[in-house]
Amino acid sequence: KFSKQSWGLENEALIVRCPRQGKPSYTVDWYYSQTNKSIPTQERNRVFASGQLLKFLPAAVADSGIYTCIVRSPTFNRTGYANVTIYKKQSDCNVPDYLMYSTVSGSEKNSKIYCPTIDLYNWTAPLEWFKNCQALQGSRYRAHKSFLVIDNVMTEDAGDYTCKFIHNENGANYSVTATRSFTVKDEQGFSLFPVIGAPAQNEIKEVEIGKNANLTCSACFGKGTQFLAAVLWQLNGTKITDFGEPRIQQEEGQNQSFSNGLACLDMVLRIADVKEEDLLLQYDCLALNLHGLRRHTVRLSRKNPIDHHS
């Protein structure tokens, strides 16, 4: 409680805010928790406290640890903890998960990527932006204040974006980088009550005894990326896996298709070596999402082999 994780790279500036807030007039004291040693406020120190901020200029791996801040309000001394981890710089391009800030989503209409934590620093424009370690170039990319704007966002724009800027402290410059993932979502997307395209309600499917048969359950759920949408088969109201007939299996994985821009899913039910008793079962195609569940029932009937003598 009242604890915050902060991280940075060695030889870069890192500024951490006390997880306990307070009015600007309140005194804030910082301590290194392991030793209870007070953090100096003099700016000549590499690590120093400045009110609600703890500054590492620059940070070193050995600075990692838990720092305690005490905000002295008129009534109580309120305590917070900053868990600081400083990592060695990676030699390769990949940014590990532990250095990533929260993922942001964008769309054609809204494609702002904010540079994480930048408000804590004394920086001047412009920001430098990189995607998957490549400097961003071209008229589609615009660095504006503390965020990046991407024009005409496409799905290929998804990836890891790094902002790089310079923090200035009393005339000295320190580099800072921060990375976050960007995902692209279809803003025009919408979600509907499931619409089952196949099979038709109460459809009778003709099958040949001894042969294999396939039944396809296909449903659409709206436009764009859908959450919690699924299609599945049931036998006599029971899940296929629970029914216990190895000859009857659902195709592993659901195929996603976009029909006229609609998001659709289908699931194939495979019946091997059709038997007489299979004709007595009720086959239910179920489509469900956040709006609800729709069910279409299918029954099998015997298809007579063609009599070549008649």
């Epitope: 807030q21 007039s25 009534t75 309120r78």
Partner: antibody, heavy 121, light 106 residues
């Protein structure tokens, strides 16, 4: 929504003690300090003190320090204010109250309905 | 402790008039809070941090001041503004309130 519900009115004799309760709901009880303010009939507001429900730490107004005890029960999200050695001038409405955002002490945004304590022989 | 003095004790004005309530402090404070209290009700936060309007409070209420002198202004009085108004400091313990200004609507 944030609610502070106080116990009912009390009539006490001089020298007795009174314990007023304040049940909090609609927020995490231990995240906010609770204060007690009283108001004598036709008079102004007077701050009695505050408790941090997380730690049980208290800060009292020096005027009441010898007679007041503030406690908090985390399991029921209830704060208590006990005032002992009651005298007639303790007749007042007692309020529990909470700031809007704890760390910024940005005024008492939420108030209980008040508990009238009457001290009479 | 910090002593808060409110003036005037009573203010009697007509609807539509401007009301100016003062709060004088015995030693300098950084912020001032203001409350409105109607008979039989708990106080209601009006202005916090000197000039910030609390949610749900009409824009005719405003606060200003610094150091030892603070003001609550009601730009155009409405009948429902009849109440007692209190200032409060949170600069040092004990927290203290002013004695209140009663606003009456003629």
């Amino acid at each position: 929504q944030v609610q502070l519900v106080q116990s009912g009115a009390e009539v006490k004799k001089p020298g007795a003690s009174v314990k007023v309760s304040c049940k909090a709901s609609g927020y995490t009880f231990t995240d906010y300090e609770l204060h007690w303010v009283r108001q004598a009939p036709g008079q102004g507001l007077e701050w009695m003190g505050t408790i941090d429900p997380e730690t049980g730490d208290t800060v009292y107004n020096q005027k009441f320090k010898a007679r007041v005890t503030m406690t908090a029960d985390k399991s029921t999200s209830t704060a208590y204010m006990e005032l002992s050695s009651l005298r007639s001038e303790d007749t007042a409405v007692y309020y529990c109250t909470r700031a809007f955002y704890n760390d910024y002490d940005d005024a008492f945004a939420y108030w209980g309905q008040g508990t009238l304590v009457t001290v009479s022989s | 402790e910090i002593v808060m003095t409110q003036s005037p004790a009573t203010l009697s004005l007509s609807p539509g008039e401007r009301a100016t309530l003062s709060c004088s402090v015995s030693s300098s404070v950084s912020y001032m809070h203001w409350y409105q209290q109607k008979p039989g009700q708990a106080p209601r936060r009006l202005i916090y941090d000197t000039s910030k309007l609390a949610s749900g409070i009409p824009a005719r209420f405003s606060g200003s001041g610094s150091g030892t002198d603070y003001t609550l202004t009601i730009s155009s009085l409405e009948p429902e503004d009849a109440a007692v108004y209190y200032c409060q400091q949170w600069n040092s313990s004990p927290l203290t309130f002013g004695g209140g200004t009663k606003v009456e609507i003629k």
